[in-house]
C-alpha cells in the first residue's frame, strides 16, 4: 500500500499526482485572467483582452479556470479595493474585505478554500482608502478541477488589468 | 579560496552556484534584484550583491530588466514602507503609497502597467506606521521587452534585501 | 474506499496521486506547508494534511524546509493576523506584526532574512482588525540549506490551510 510504514511526510511524498506521458512534453499550461472592468458589481474573469491569456489547455467554465492536466500548479490572485470616507454624520460601520481562491471538485459538496486574504476597513476614520491583497501558492491539482474566486467587497474593486487578476501555471 | 577578503555581499556574489553545461533548451532565465540601500531617495535595482542575481540572459539596463527571450515569465516585486507620526500640530495629510511594475515594449510608445498595488496612509492617526506591498503574475513577454518599476512614496521605503525586491523567471 | 467516513481534510490526505517512475531530470522539487491549527501559540509547519505536500526530495526538519538539490527556487509564505479592539479604558499600545522567511546555511553562522513583511496595528483605533501579509521571490539555494520562518504576533495568527502557509519550488 502506498505510504505504509512511512513517516507522514514521507508518505505524503510517496503518494503524488499522475504525470502525463505527453509527446508534447514541452507544453507549459499557464493562464492569467483579468477582472472585466465593464462589469462594476461583479467580478468576471476574462482572458481575451489586454495582457490576459490561456495557454496549453487552460480554459474557462462558469467564471472558473479548468485545470488542463494533473500536476502541481502555482495559483495566484490579486485584488485592489478603494473607497471614500463616510460622511461625518454617517455611522462608521466596519467594512469586511476578503478575497479567496477556491477549488471545486465534486468529491466535496462545497468549495475548498486554497488561498484567503482578509482586511477590516473603517472608512469613517480614514477618509479615502485603498487596500491591496495578493496571494499565491503551489497546489496539487487534478485534470478537470475548477479554480474560482470569491470576493467580499466587490463594489469597492479597482478593476484594471494591473490591479485585479487571477492566474495559474504548471510547475 | 572563494570569497576570501571580500565583504559578505561581495563574497555572496563571488560564490555562485555551480552551473551545469546544459543544452540551450534547459536554460531558465531568472533574475532577482534588490533595492540599493545606499540610495535613500531613489529606488535603484542591483543584481551584484547579497542574494540578488541575473541568470541565463537577463540583464539590467537603465534600471530595467531586459527580457532575454520571448515566452511566459512570472514577474514579481515587493516594497515595504515606513514612517513616523506627524507632529500633533501638523496637518495630517494622507500619504499615497503605490508600487507598479511596468512594461516598455517596442509595440507600445508608453509604459504599460503590469502589476499595481496602492495604499493610503494617514500618519496623524496611526503614529509610526509600516506597510508592505507584494504582487506577482505571469505575462507573455517578448525578447527585448523592458520591465521597470514606478513607486510613489520612495522616501518611505525600508531598503533592505528582504523587503524591497523585483524579479522574474521564465516558466 | 479512500476517504469514506473521513472529514474533508482527512479524506483529502487519504486520496493522493500515484507517482510516475520519472527520469531524474524531470524531478521538480516542491513543497507547500500549512500552519498547524492545533498549536495556538506557536507556528508549526505541517506537510501531512489538507493540501500540503513535500515532493521530490523536500523534507521538513526542526520546523525548517531542507533544500533537496542546489538551484534556483521560488520561495513564498503568507500569514493572516486578526485581533479584537482594546477595551476603551486600556492603553492603546501599537502591535508590531512581522513575518520573515529566513535562510540558514553552512556558509553563514546566522539566519539570513530572505523575505520580510511588517505592519503596525493600533487596535484601540480600529476595533476588530484583520491583516494579511504575503511575499515570495526567487533565490539561489544550495543542497542542505534550511528555510524557516520567524513571526512577530503569533498569538494573533488566523491558522487555517488557506491563510497561513509556507512553500517553495524549484525553477
Amino acid at each position: 500500500l502506498p505510504g505504509v510504514g512511512l513517516t507522514p511526510s514521507a508518505a505524503q511524498t510517496a503518494r503524488q499526482h499522475p504525470k502525463m506521458h505527453l509527446a508534447h512534453s514541452t507544453l507549459k499550461p499557464a493562464a492569467h485572467l483579468i477582472g472585466d472592468p465593464s462589469k462594476q458589481n461583479s467580478l468576471l474573469w476574462r482572458a481575451n483582452t489586454d495582457r490576459a491569456f490561456l495557454q496549453d489547455g487552460f480554459s474557462l467554465s462558469n467564471n472558473s479556470l479548468l485545470v488542463p492536466t494533473s500536476g502541481i500548479y502555482f495559483v495566484y490572485s490579486q485584488v485592489v479595493f478603494s473607497g471614500k470616507a463616510y460622511s461625518p454624520k454617517a455611522t462608521s460601520s466596519p467594512l469586511y474585505l476578503a478575497h479567496e481562491v477556491q477549488l471545486f471538485s465534486s468529491q466535496y459538496p462545497f468549495h475548498v478554500p486554497l488561498l484567503s486574504s482578509q482586511k477590516m476597513v473603517y472608512p469613517g476614520l480614514q477618509e479615502p482608502w485603498l487596500h491591496s491583497m495578493y496571494h499565491g501558492a503551489a497546489f496539487q491539482l487534478t485534470q478537470g478541477d475548477q479554480l474560482s474566486t470569491h470576493t467580499d467587497g466587490i463594489p469597492h474593486l479597482v478593476l484594471s488589468p494591473s490591479t485585479v487578476f487571477f492566474g495559474a501555471f504548471a510547475l | 579560496l572563494p570569497g576570501v577578503g571580500l565583504t559578505p555581499s561581495a563574497a555572496q556574489t563571488a560564490r555562485q552556484h555551480p552551473k551545469m553545461h546544459l543544452a540551450h533548451s534547459t536554460l531558465k532565465p531568472a533574475a532577482h534584484l534588490i533595492g540599493d540601500p545606499s540610495k535613500q531617495n531613489s529606488l535603484l535595482w542591483r543584481a551584484n550583491t547579497d542574494r540578488a542575481f541575473l541568470q541565463d540572459g537577463f540583464s539590467l539596463s537603465n534600471n530595467s530588466l531586459l527580457v532575454p527571450t520571448s515566452g511566459i515569465y512570472f514577474v514579481y516585486s515587493q516594497v515595504v514602507f515606513s514612517g513616523k507620526a506627524y507632529s500633533p500640530k501638523a496637518t495630517s495629510s494622507p500619504l499615497y503609497l503605490a508600487h507598479e511594475v511596468q512594461l516598455f515594449s517596442s509595440q507600445y510608445p508608453f509604459h504599460v502597467p503590469l502589476l499595481s498595488s496602492q495604499k493610503m496612509v494617514y500618519p496623524g492617526l496611526q503614529e509610526p506606521w509600516l506597510h508592505s506591498m507584494y504582487h506577482g503574475a505571469a505575462f507573455q513577454l517578448t525578447q527585448g521587452d523592458q520591465l521597470s518599476t514606478h513607486t510613489d512614496g520612495i522616501p518611505h521605503l525600508v531598503l533592505s534585501p528582504s523587503t524591497v525586491f523585483f524579479g522574474a523567471f521564465a516558466l | 474506499l479512500p476517504g469514506v467516513g473521513l472529514t474533508p481534510s482527512a479524506a483529502q490526505t487519504a486520496r493522493q496521486h500515484p507517482k510516475m517512475h520519472l527520469a531524474h531530470s524531470t524531478l521538480k522539487p516542491a513543497a507547500h506547508l500549512i500552519g498547524d491549527p492545533s498549536k495556538q501559540n506557536s507556528l508549526l509547519w505541517r506537510a501531512n494534511t489538507d493540501r500540503a505536500f513535500l515532493q521530490d526530495g523536500f523534507s521538513l526538519s526542526n520546523n525548517s524546509l531542507l533544500v533537496p538539490t542546489s538551484g534556483i527556487y521560488f520561495v513564498y509564505s503568507q500569514v493572516v493576523f486578526s485581533g479584537k479592539a482594546y477595551s476603551p479604558k486600556a492603553t492603546s499600545s501599537p502591535l508590531y506584526l512581522a513575518h520573515e522567511v529566513q535562510l540558514f546555511s553552512s556558509q553563514y553562522p546566522f539566519h539570513v532574512p530572505l523575505l520580510s513583511s511588517q505592519k503596525m496595528v493600533y487596535p484601540g483605533l480600529q476595533e476588530p482588525w484583520l491583516h494579511s501579509m504575503y511575499h515570495g521571490a526567487a533565490f539561489q539555494l544550495t543542497q542542505g540549506d534550511q528555510l524557516s520562518t520567524h513571526t512577530d504576533g503569533i498569538p494573533h495568527l488566523v491558522l487555517s490551510p488557506s491563510t497561513v502557509f509556507f512553500g517553495a519550488f524549484a525553477l
Epitope: 490576459a52 495557454q55 488542463p68 485534470q143 478537470g144 | - | -
Partner: antibody, heavy 118, light 107 residues
Framework: EVQLVESGGGLVQPGGSLRLSCAAS????????IHWVRQAPGKGLEWVGY????????NYNEKFKGRATISSDKSKNTAYLQMNSLRAEDTAVYYC???????????WGQGTLVTVSS | DIQMTQSPSSLSASVGDRVTITCRAS??????VAWYQQKPGKAPKLQIY???HRYTGVPSRFSGSGSGTDFTLTISSLQPEDFATYYC?????????FGQGTKVEIK
Amino acid sequence: EVQLVESGGGLVQPGGSLRLSCAASGYTFTSYVIHWVRQAPGKGLEWVGYNNPYNDGTNYNEKFKGRATISSDKSKNTAYLQMNSLRAEDTAVYYCSRPTMLPWFAYWGQGTLVTVSS
Amino acid sequence: DIQMTQSPSSLSASVGDRVTITCRASQAVSSAVAWYQQKPGKAPKLQIYSASHRYTGVPSRFSGSGSGTDFTLTISSLQPEDFATYYCQQHYYTPWTFGQGTKVEIK
C-alpha cells in the same frame, strides 16, 4: 496503446433512458478525464460533459444538465453516460474521448449509435 | 455559448492543391482553437490545438493560424488521404463548441 470502446447504443423510445459505457485501456484510467461528445446524423459535434475517474469531478454542457449524468467505475476502467427523457433530437452517434490537455479530444472510441424513435 | 462558423461548408480540390478553411468565433477566444479531421463512419482526429500547434503525428502540410475571432486551417499540398470533413473547436470557454464542418471533396 490507448483504446476506448463504447457500448450500449440502440433503439430507445421517446421519454426513455440510455446508459452508455466506455471501456478504457492502455493508460492509467485515473490520470485523465473522459469526455462524451455526440454527433447527430449528418451534423456537427456537440460536447456533452466530462468525468474525472480519479475524484469523480464532473463538468457538463449546460444544455444537458439535469438530463445527463457522467460517472465512472475505477475498478472496471469504465466511464458511463446516463441520459434521461430522450427525444428524437437526441438521436446521434455518442463518442467517448480521452484528452491530453483537458479540452483537446485526442483519443476517441469508435462511437455507438443511439436512435430515439417510437 | 460561443458560436463557431466555418467557411466554406464544402469545397472541391485536387491532389497537390493548397486548401484553406476558415473559422470565425462569435466572440474573441484568444488562440484557443483546435481542428479535427473526420472521415465517413470514423471518429474525429485531432490535428491542431491552440490555433497553430500540430498534434503528434500530424503531417507538416497541416498548419493553423489566427487569434481572437478569425482562424485558418491550411493544407499546403492536398494528399489523397486528406479528403475528409474538418471541424474547428473553441477551447476557450465551456461549453466547448464546434463549427458545422467543412467537407473537402475530390474535384
